[in-house]
């Protein structure tokens, strides 16, 4: 069944900047991806990029650069300047609506203690919900 | 509010087709996807397809593949599957539903039209 | 396909009794969705994502389950609770329907 996995980095030359890797395993193909931190979309989160594959993507502060990486996996640098930057412990989901079967949604966050430019290998997330 | 109207009943000879409409009303049309279920006398529900109307993409249950083909005109916000080759066993009513919404959260298939009833016989 | 097998097919409960309805997946869905019909009307979201309750739901409907095994309960069933109730999977294509269970009132 389908998975969404979620891998968040900080970078080494810029202690406050993150990247955010997000994937999806499935066979449906993905209509849209939505990126947001603070916690799901919809449900408290706030929207940092949204990935169309015909329509483009759009960015809000603090996100910096969004770009499909593969076909069913996209990344997104956060600027780390500015009140709005984030924070070790931030959580951050990513929900790829995939055709036919719906939304699947997944979020992680910092590794704890995790060296600046480390970070573990991206596993499957905790699926939050799939409409 | 969201209204789901589907057409009406339809009686037709074995081997004819049949297109139904679904027409779409108090939503954006392009926004939700739409899910067709059969549902014959007194059984239940069957998955035949989903269309995304934003982009036309179709999704098939296998088993109605060649059966049943769906299709949208964006510009009346209206949904339609034909049925071709009909028997007896395509005797059922034919629901429309709201499918996904891509942008947010929300519940599958919260909306669905009245049904079409398609009798087939001679 | 993933067969979805639903128990009991019909039964019957007194008001006030409580009520639940099982849904047993011939292979593991991530969640399972459910639906109220009754007769002459068209099938209704009743709960998504396994225990989210659908808009103006009675509080007295509650899901749960996971993996293989799912299931609707009613803590007090009351004369409009009397409907077939379907489960229903999309973690896998095609998305599948229980056969039904058809819940009357005594």
């Known amino acids: 069944t389908p998975e969404v996995w979620v891998q968040v980095r900080m970078e080494a030359t810029e202690l406050s900047s993150f990247t955010i890797r997000c994937g999806f395993l499935g066979s449906g193909s993905i209509s849209l991806v939505t990126v947001s931190w603070g916690g799901p979309n919809g449900a408290g989160g706030t929207t940092l990029a949204v990935l169309h594959p015909e329509r483009g993507i759009r960015q809000w502060a603090p996100a910096r650069q969004a770009r499909w990486e593969t076909q069913s996996s996209i990344s997104l640098i956060l600027e780390g300047s500015g009140a709005s930057s984030p924070c070790a412990n931030t959580t951050f989901c990513c929900k790829f609506a995939s055709f036919p079967e719906g939304s699947w949604e997944a979020c992680g966050s910092l590794p704890p203690s995790s060296d600046p430019g480390l970070s573990a290998p991206p596993t499957p997330a905790p699926i939050l919900r799939a409409d | 509010e969201v209204q789901l109207q589907e057409s009406g009943a339809e009686h037709v000879m074995p081997g004819a087709s049949v297109k139904m409409s679904c027409k779409a009303a108090g939503y954006t049309f392009t926004d939700y996807w739409m899910y067709w279920v059969k549902q014959r006398p007194g059984q239940g529900l069957e998955w035949i397809g989903t269309i995304d109307t934003s982009d036309h993409k179709t999704s098939y249950n296998q088993k109605f593949r060649g059966k049943a083909t769906l299709t949208v005109d964006e510009s009346s916000s209206t949904a339609y599957m034909q049925l071709s080759s009909l028997t007896s066993e395509d005797s059922a009513v034919y629901y429309c539903?709201?499918?996904?919404?891509?942008?947010?959260?929300?519940?599958?298939?919260?909306?669905w039209g009245q049904g079409t009833s398609v009798t087939v016989s001679s | 396909q993933n067969v979805l097998t639903q128990s009991p097919a019909i039964m019957s409960a007194s008001p006030g009794e409580k009520v639940t309805i099982t849904c047993s997946a011939g292979s593991s869905v991530n969640y399972m969705h459910w639906f109220q019909q009754k007769p002459g009307t068209s099938p209704k979201l009743w709960i998504y994502?396994?225990?989210n309750l659908a808009s103006g739901v009675p509080a007295r409907f509650s899901g749960s389950g996971s993996g293989t095994s799912y299931s609707l309960t009613i803590s007090r069933m009351e004369a409009e609770d009397a409907a077939t109730y379907y489960c229903?999977?999309?973690?896998?294509?095609?998305?599948?329907f229980g056969s039904g269970t058809k819940l009357e009132i005594k």
């Open positions: 539903a709201r499918d996904f919404i891509i942008t947010v959260n929300y519940p599958v298939v919260d909306y």
């Open positions: 994502s396994t225990s």
């Open positions: 229903q999977q999309r973690s896998s294509l095609p998305f599948t």
